[in-house]
Amino acid sequence: CEEPPTFEAMELIGKPKPYYEIGERVDYKCKKGYFYIPPLATHTICDRNHTWLPVSDDACYRETCPYIRDPLNGQAVPANGTYEFGYQMHFICNEGYYLIGEEILYCELKGSVAIWSGKPPICEKVLCTPPPKIKNGKHTFSEVEVFEYLDAVTYSCDPAPGPDPFSLIGESTIYCGDNSVWSRAAPECKVVKCRFPVVENGKQISGFGKKFYYKATVMFECDKGFYLDGSDTIVCDSNSTWDPPVPKCLKVLPPSSTKPPALSHSVSTSSTTKSPASSASGPRPTYKPPVSNYPGYPKPEEGILDSLD
């Protein structure tokens, strides 16, 4: 027989020879980090076919690291369902708790003993420090010094000293989240007032109000013979500007028409007549139909007010 087989978990006792005689036996022992559990054989014999009798290293088991309990308010999850060396242990905390320490421990061999690479972590309750104070506003539970997981606070704006109120920009409610961090940045309180939206050759058809503050929404339509260039609906954004910008109402120009050939007894001539507007400087907008009243929207005449005041 040629050299005996090699295994991951056991090694040959003594030095291997280049060849073995029929009937010759070789013995194995468990490698470092593995231990023998009877009754499986750990030897083989060169049989008369010049092959080694079947043998496996199933009798040698990996050293295992000590059992780790689940941390309080968390779980220890063996990566491959085993505590054997060379494998990992993952730690997860329950919702509302966060990990202090290593998230992964490795089962390592020290000498012939399998030990964990570090101390198991602990799961600590998620606690948040008070959320930020904001200028011109306040939040609920301002007297509380420590917030637990998912505790929420709601911001509101102070009354403004002038005629225009403070608007709350952003989400009013934030909560204590993972890693002891608030779910989002605090909102801000500031005066947001958009300029009065005027459209020449058109008019506002909804969103009427004394003044136009944050998120005020206005709709327009154009007079007969004009078409809307831009959006018919605009919203006052946090920078005190209309988004999209205030539209324009542009004059509807008839398309240039070509006269049919003039007929006579002898000569036929054709000429192209330009629309008077086509000689004006600058690009001429393509024909668009005028914007009519929008069905379903109140007309100003109907006296339906959507006051934003």
Partner: antibody, heavy 119, light 107 residues
């Protein structure tokens, strides 16, 4: 407090031009729009147009396009209105008035400038 | 443009009276209406904006109301300094237009 000081009376010949001024004080000039309003003797008020000093944007009453030109000088907090090709129809008192954020109500008015067009 | 009509060009009332000045628009103006006072010396003041909002510093005896096309200015207790011409002004549509004015006199 907001004050608007307008230039003195003008006597001009037909066909000529005139430049009226309106000096603002008591507020940040670029924060308010300047409007101009015409009042013919014994008659009502007519809005000419407005100019927004912050960006120089303006809107005119179609009737006064070509007749009036609105400008501002932010360094001196002064608004100007040029009136062109004057006729007797342009004899009137011209007021400047401010409005905030383009809201078309005019809380502060100048004292008015009388323009008389006569040969 | 939108025509603003003040049908009463002049009005006589006694001190202490309640006076109402009316103004109508040629089409609905959705409360986009202001009132001004012009004194005999020519000085102009804003009294009321957006139909019923009192401008700061204006006495509370002045009030405004209305909707659609019809609007009014009321002086609840006429005082000598209220002698003036009163103008309404719409601003729903360019050009902004004024009424022809109502001259208020003391009986």
């Amino acid at each position: 407090q907001v004050q608007l000081q307008q230039s003195g009376p003008e006597l001009v010949k037909p066909g000529a031009s005139v430049k009226l001024s309106c000096k603002a004080s008591g507020y940040t000039f670029t924060n308010y729009d300047i409007n101009w309003v015409k009042q013919r003797p014994g008659q009502g008020l007519e809005w000419i147009g407005w100019i927004y000093p912050r960006d120089g944007s303006f809107k005119y009453n179609e009737k006064f396009k070509g007749k009036a030109t609105l400008t501002v000088d932010t360094s001196s907090s002064t608004a100007y209105m040029d009136l062109h090709s004057l006729t007797s129809e342009d004899s009137a008192v011209f007021f400047c008035a401010v409005s905030e954020d383009g809201y078309p109500w005019f809380p502060y008015w100048g004292q008015g400038t009388l323009v008389t067009v006569s040969a | 443009g939108i025509q603003m009509t003040q049908t009463t060009s002049s009005l006589s009332a006694s001190l202490g009276d309640r006076v109402t000045i009316s103004c109508s628009a040629s089409q609905g103006i959705s409360n986009y209406l202001n009132w001004y006072q012009q004194k005999p010396d020519g000085t102009v003041k804003l009294l009321i904006y957006y139909t019923s909002s009192l401008h700061s510093g204006v006495p509370s005896r002045f009030s405004g109301s209305g909707s659609g096309t019809d609007y009014s200015l009321t002086i609840s207790n006429l005082e000598p300094e209220d002698i003036a011409t009163y103008y309404c002004q719409q601003y729903i549509k360019l050009p902004f237009t004024f009424g022809s004015g109502t001259k208020l006199e003391i009986k």
